[in-house]
Interface confidence: low
C-alpha cells in the first residue's frame, strides 16, 4: 500500500487552529512536475457533504512530502469530507477523512467501518440533541432509508446493512428530517473486495494474518498497519509518537499524537493514533489496553507490563505478544506467510531463528508438503540470529501448499508454516490482435487470453517479415498498453507472436501462436482545399474542392467529406468514391444548422490531411407553400400571378420568392423577390411575347419555405423581344433577384 497518512488536528475549541496535514512516506512524493510524478493534493470534497461557502482554505506545502490545509473560520467549515491524493501512476491513492460536528443532533458511535464482503455492517448514530422527527439515512448523498424517531434503541439509530458488497462503500449520513445537514452523523463504510482473510482476484489468496488491528488489502494482500505499527504483518510497534510505514514520521507538538485522527489508505480508514481513544482522540487508553483507538488488549503473562503504545513489555528471559514464550525456546523470526515461485525454478529460501542455546545450521530444516525434508546448504550466523539458506530442487506443481520451517535445540522447538504458491508461466492461447494499421506501422493489442498464471508483468512482442529467416525483432511493453510497431515496410506481411512473463525468476512463458499482419498501402499526402459551396435548399449543400498539382499518379481512392454539427455533437460523413470528383451534393442536412465542413483524400483505409475547415450556416426551414397559385396573361409581356397565403405560419412572412422559367428551356430559372408579404398578387413584366412560362413560388420567414405547385401560362401576341422579366406588385415595380 502507498505510505500516505492524512492527519486531522481535533482540538476544536477554535476552528482557526484546526488543520489537516497529508504526509507521504513515498520516495519523492509530492514534488510535482519533476520526474517524481504528480504532487500531493489535499482538498475538501463537496460532492456529498456541501457546506456554506466561506473564505478559501489555505494550502501550504512543507517540503516535498507534506501539505497542510488551514484557514477554517467557523465550525461549519470543518464538517464534511476531506481527501488527500498521493502516489504516482497505478499507485495513486486517495485517503479520506470524514469530520462530524461535535454539536450535531446525531453523532456516529464509530465513523469508519471496515467490513468484509458479505458481512453485515451496522452503523450506529447516537442521539446528541433529540428531535421528534424521522431520521433519514443517506448513502453517498442519495436517500437510502427512513427510521421513525421512536425507533431509537438505547438512544441510538441503527442502520443494518446485511451482505454488503464493495459497491455499498461510501459516505453514509443520518439526519433528522428538516434539520440542517450539518447536524448529521457522517460515516464512512469501506467494504473489502473479499471475504474475511482473503485477497486477490477471485479472493483465492489467504491474507498474512495482520496483527495489532492491521487490515489486509484486498488487492495486494499487504497489511495496512494502524498508525504506530510497522512490519509486513504489523508485528512491530513504533516508538511513542511515531507513525508511517517505517515509523519515519513524528507527531507534531509536545503532546505527541494526542488529539490527532490518522487516516490511511483503504481498507484501513481512520483511527486515533496508538495509545489514544475517544471522539477527539484526547483520552489515553485504559489500563490493559493499547494500540490505535485502544482497541487491543494486552493480557501480559510472566510479569510483562502493558504499554499503551506498544503492548506487552516483557521482562528479561521472555518474549511473544503476551510474554508467553521463554527466551530459551528457539524462535523462527520474520518468516513470510506466503511465497511465490515459478514452475521449474530452483529458488533459495531463507529461514532465520534465534534462541538459547543458539541455533546452528543443522538445527534448522525445511519440510515440503509431501513430507520431504531439506537441509540447509549454508548458514549465516549473526549475534542475534542464525539464517539458514535452502536450495530448493526444481519446483513442480505438486510443491504448492504449506511448507514448514522448523528449528530444534535443547531449549525446545519452534516451527512456522508458510504457503508456497508454484505458478505456471503464462502462455498465450491466441495470437495478438491487430487494432489499426498504417503503411509503416501496426498497432497491436498484445494481451490475449493465456494459460498459466498471472499477473502479467511484461509482454514481449516478436515480429519479422513473413517468410523471412532474419532474426525476430522484439519489443517489450507494459501489459496494459497497446503496442505500435514502427518503421515497417508498406504493403508487407509480418508474422507477429506474443511472449508473456509473470513476476519472478523463471516467469517467462513460451511464445504464443503467430499471426499475419499486413501493413497498409501508403497514406495519401495531398491536402485538398475547399473551393466553395452554395446552399441549394434548407437541407442541401453543393460543395466543391481542389487538390494541389503534383507530378506522378494520384495516391487516393476517393474523398471523405465531414460535416460537424457542434450544437448536437453529431458528425455526418459522406464518401465520394471517385478520386477524380471535385464536387458533391450533400442532402438531408438539418435546416438552420451551423456546420463545420472539411474534405480529405483517402487511400485504402487511410485518410490524408483534412482541408482547412469551412463554416456553413444552412438557412432554417421555412414556412409552408403558398396556396392556389394562379397565372393570367395580361399582355404580350406581362403575366399576373395570384395566390393565397400559406396556412399555419410559424411567424410573419418577410418576402415571397417567384421562380420564372421558360417552359422546355435549358437555362437556369430566375428568382424574383416580392418584398411586400401582405400582397397576394404580383405582375411579372418584361416577358417575351407568345412564350410559355412556368411559375412557382415560396415564402420566406427566417429561411425559404416549400415551393408551391407549378403553374404554366403563355404571354399574348407577337410583341418585341423583352429584356427579361421583372415584377410589379400592384402598381409598384420591384428589382430582379437572380
Amino acid at each position: 500500500a502507498v505510505d500516505l497518512t492524512l492527519l486531522a488536528n481535533l482540538r476544536l475549541t477554535d476552528p482557526q487552529r484546526f488543520f489537516l496535514t497529508c504526509v507521504s512516506g513515498e520516495a519523492g512524493a509530492g514534488r510535482g512536475s519533476d520526474a517524481w510524478g504528480p504532487p500531493l493534493l489535499l482538498e475538501k470534497d463537496d460532492r456529498i457533504v456541501r457546506t456554506p461557502p466561506g473564505p478559501p482554505l489555505r494550502l501550504a506545502r512543507n517540503g516535498s512530502h507534506q501539505v497542510t490545509l488551514r484557514g477554517f473560520s467557523k465550525p461549519s467549515d470543518l464538517v464534511g469530507v476531506f481527501s488527500c491524493v498521493g502516489g504516482a501512476g497505478a499507485r495513486r491513492t486517495r485517503v479520506i477523512y470524514v469530520h462530524n460536528s461535535p454539536g450535531a443532533h446525531l453523532l456516529p458511535d464509530k465513523v469508519t467501518h471496515t467490513v468484509n464482503k458479505g458481512d453485515t455492517a451496522v452503523l450506529s448514530a447516537r442521539v446528541h440533541k433529540e428531535k421528534q422527527t424521522d431520521v433519514i439515512w443517506k448513502s453517498n448523498g442519495s436517500y437510502f432509508y427512513t427510521l421513525d424517531w421512536h425507533e431509537a434503541q438505547d438512544g441510538r439509530f441503527l442502520l443494518q446493512l446485511p451482505n454488503v458488497q464493495p459497491p455499498s462503500s461510501g459516505i453514509y449520513s443520518a439526519t433528522y428530517l428538516e434539520a440542517s445537514p450539518l447536524g448529521s452523523a457522517f460515516f464512512r463504510l469501506i467494504v473489502r473486495g473479499c471475504g474475511a482473510g482473503r485477497w486477490g482476484p477471485g479472493c483465492t489468496k489467504e491474507c498474512p494474518g495482520c496483527l495489532h488491528g492491521g487490515v489486509c488489502h484486498d488487492h495486494d494482500g499487504e497489511c495496512v498497519c494502524p498508525p504506530g505499527f510497522t512490519g509486513t504483518r504489523c508485528e512491530q510497534a513504533c516508538r511513542e509518537g511515531r507513525f508511517g510505514q517505517s515509523c519515519q514520521e513524528q507527531c507534531p507538538g509536545i503532546s505527541g499524537c494526542r488529539g490527532l485522527t490518522f487516516c490511511l489508505p483503504d481498507p484501513y480508514g481512520c483511527s486515533c493514533g496508538s495509545g489514544w481513544r475517544g471522539s477527539q482522540c484526547q483520552e489515553a487508553c485504559a489500563p490493559g489496553h493499547f494500540g490505535a483507538d485502544c482497541r487491543l488488549q494486552c493480557q501480559c503473562q510472566n510479569g510483562g507490563t502493558c504499554d499503551r503504545f506498544s503492548g506487552c513489555v516483557c521482562p528479561s528471559g521472555w518474549h511473544g505478544v503476551h510474554c508467553e514464550k521463554s527466551d530459551r525456546i528457539p524462535q523462527i523470526l520474520n518468516m513470510a506467510s506466503e511465497l511465490e515461485f515459478n514452475l521449474e525454478t530452483m529458488p533459495r529460501i531463507n529461514c532465520a531463528a534465534a534462541g538459547n542455546p543458539f541455533p546452528v545450521r543443522g538445527s534448522i530444516e525445511l519440510r515440503k508438503p509431501d513430507g520431504t525434508v531439506l537441509l540447509s546448504t549454508k548458514a549465516i550466523v549473526e549475534p542475534e540470529k542464525t539464517t539458514a539458506e535452502f536450495e530448493v530442487p526444481r519446483l513442480v506443481l505438486a510443491d504448492s501448499g504449506f511448507w514448514e520451517c522448523r528449528v530444534s535445540t535443547s531449549g525446545g522447538q519452534d516451527s512456522r508454516r508458510f504457503k508456497v504458491n508454484v505458478k505456471v508461466p503464462p502462455v498465450p492461447l491466441a495470437a495478438p490482435r491487430l487494432l489499426t494499421k498504417q503503411s509503416r506501422q501496426l498497432v497491436v493489442s498484445p494481451l490475449v487470453s493465456f494459460s498459466g498464471d498471472g499477473p502479467i508483468s511484461t509482454v514481449r512482442l516478436h515480429y519479422r517479415p513473413q517468410d523471412s529467416t532474419m532474426d525476430w525483432s522484439t519489443i517489450v511493453v507494459d501489459p496494459s498498453e497497446n503496442v505500435t510497431l514502427m518503421n515497417l515496410r508498406p504493403k508487407t506481411g509480418y508474422s507477429v507472436r506474443v511472449q508473456l512473463s509473470r513476476p519472478g525468476e523463471g516467469g517467462e512463458g513460451a511464445w504464443g501462436p503467430p499471426t499475419l499482419m499486413t501493413t497498409d498501402c501508403p497514406e495519401p499526402l495531398l491536402q485538398p482545399w475547399l473551393e466553395g459551396w452554395h446552399v441549394e435548399g434548407t437541407d442541401r449543400l453543393r460543395v466543391s474542392w481542389s487538390l494541389p498539382l503534383v507530378p506522378g499518379p494520384l495516391v487516393g481512392d476517393g474523398f471523405l467529406l465531414r460535416l460537424w454539427d457542434g450544437t448536437r455533437g453529431q458528425e455526418r460523413r459522406e464518401n465520394v468514391s471517385s478520386p477524380q470528383a471535385r464536387t458533391a451534393l450533400l442532402t438531408g442536412l438539418t435546416p438552420g444548422t451551423h456546420y463545420q465542413l472539411d474534405v480529405q483524400l483517402y487511400h485504402c483505409t487511410l485518410l490524408g490531411p483534412a482541408s482547412p475547415p469551412a463554416h456553413v450556416l444552412l438557412p432554417p426551414s421555412g414556412p409552408p407553400a403558398p396556396r392556389h397559385l394562379h397565372a393570367q396573361a395580361l399582355s404580350d409581356s406581362e403575366i399576373q400571378l395570384t395566390w393565397k397565403h400559406p396556412e399555419a405560419l410559424p411567424g410573419p412572412i418577410s418576402k415571397y420568392v417567384v421562380e420564372v422559367q421558360v417552359a422546355g428551356g435549358a437555362g437556369d430559372p430566375l428568382w424574383i423577390d416580392v418584398d411586400r408579404p401582405e400582397e397576394t398578387s404580383t405582375i411579372i413584366r418584361g416577358l417575351n411575347a407568345s412564350t410559355r412560362y412556368l411559375f412557382r413560388m415560396r415564402a420566406s420567414i427566417q429561411g425559404l419555405g416549400d415551393w408551391s405547385n407549378t403553374v404554366e401560362e403563355s404571354t399574348l401576341g407577337n410583341g418585341l423581344q423583352a429584356e427579361g422579366p421583372v415584377q410589379e406588385s400592384r402598381a409598384a415595380e420591384e428589382g430582379l433577384d437572380q
Epitope: 453485515t120 424521522d134 433519514i136 439515512w137 436517500y143 437510502f144 432509508y145 427512513t146 427510521l147 421513525d148 421512536h150 425507533e151 431509537a152 434503541q153 438505547d154 441503527l158 443494518q160 446493512l161 446485511p162 428530517l177
Partner: antibody
Framework: EVQLLESGGGLVQPGGSLRLSCAAS????????MQWVRQAPGKGLEWFSS????????IYADSVKGRFTISRDNSKNTLYLQMNSLRAEDTAVYYC???????????WGQGTLVTVSS | DIQMTQSPGTLSLSPGERATLSCRAS????????LAWYQQKPGQPPRLLIY???NRATGIPGRFSGSGSGTDFTLTISRLEPEDFAVYYC?????????FGGGTKVEIK
C-alpha cells in the same frame, strides 16, 4: 427460501384476548424489522405494528396502541402479537411480514383469521 | 399520515390487453421513489411486485413495470395473462407510518 407461518387465530368475544405467533425460517431473523399487517374482510391492507431487530424498539398505529403488544424471540425465530381488549372492528386476517431495506414488505405469511364476535 | 389513493377501483379487461393502474399520494414522501406495488389473489397473502417505484422484485415477469416519482405512480401490465387477474395495492414506505392504497381490482371482462 423465506417462510413465515402465522398461528393462534380464532373466534374471540369482544373485550377478550388472543396471542398470535409467526414462525420464521430461511433467513437470519435477528437482522430484520418484522411487522404485523391486517386485512378486514373485503377491505384493503392496514399496517399496524413493527418491531426492530433487537426487540428494543416497537411501533404501533393509533388504532391498536395500548391494546396490542408486538414482541419477538430471536433465539426461536418467532414473532408474537398479544391482542387485548379486542373489538369487532379488529376482525381481520392477520399477516406477519418481513420488512426489506428500506421499507417495502418483501415476504408475507399466509395469514391467520381473527374473528371478534359475541 | 400520507393517504394513498388508487384508481380506478375496478378495471375490467380481457386477457392480452394492457392494464394501467394509478396510485397518488396526498403529499410527497421521503425519497420520492419509495413506493411498492403488491398483488393479492383471493385467499392468498400479498406478493411484492415492484419496489423503488420501478424495480421488479425477484421472479416477477417482465410484463409488469412501474413508473412515476413524487406523488403520481403507475403500474403497467403490458399484456394481461389469466393469472394476472387480482387486486393490486400500492404502498409508500418513505415516511412513517408506511401506508397502503385502497387497491385496484383487475377483473376479466
Amino acid at each position: 427460501e423465506v417462510q413465515l407461518l402465522e398461528s393462534g387465530g380464532g373466534l374471540v368475544q369482544p373485550g377478550g384476548s388472543l396471542r398470535l405467533s409467526c414462525a420464521a425460517s430461511g433467513f437470519t431473523f435477528s437482522r430484520y424489522v418484522m411487522q404485523w399487517v391486517r386485512q378486514a374482510p373485503g377491505k384493503g391492507l392496514e399496517w399496524f405494528s413493527s418491531i426492530y431487530p433487537s426487540g428494543g424498539a416497537t411501533i404501533y398505529a393509533d388504532s391498536v396502541k395500548g391494546r396490542f403488544t408486538i414482541s419477538r424471540d430471536n433465539s426461536k425465530n418467532t414473532l408474537y402479537l398479544q391482542m387485548n381488549s379486542l373489538r369487532a372492528e379488529d376482525t381481520a386476517v392477520y399477516y406477519c411480514a418481513r420488512r426489506g431495506i428500506p421499507g417495502y414488505f418483501d415476504s408475507w405469511g399466509q395469514g391467520t383469521l381473527v374473528t371478534v364476535s359475541s | 399520515d400520507i393517504q394513498m389513493t388508487q384508481s380506478p377501483g375496478t378495471l375490467s379487461l380481457s386477457p392480452g390487453e394492457r392494464a394501467t393502474l394509478s396510485c397518488r399520494a396526498s403529499q410527497s414522501f421521503v425519497g420520492s421513489r419509495n413506493l411498492a406495488w403488491y398483488q393479492q389473489k383471493p385467499g392468498q397473502p400479498p406478493r411484492l411486485l415492484i419496489y423503488g417505484a420501478f424495480n421488479r422484485a425477484t421472479g416477477i415477469p417482465g410484463r409488469f413495470s412501474g413508473s412515476g416519482s413524487g406523488t403520481d405512480f403507475t403500474l403497467t401490465i403490458s399484456r394481461l395473462e389469466p393469472e394476472d387477474f387480482a387486486v393490486y395495492y400500492c404502498q409508500q414506505y418513505g415516511t412513517s407510518p408506511r401506508t397502503f392504497g385502497g387497491g385496484t381490482k383487475v377483473e376479466i371482462k
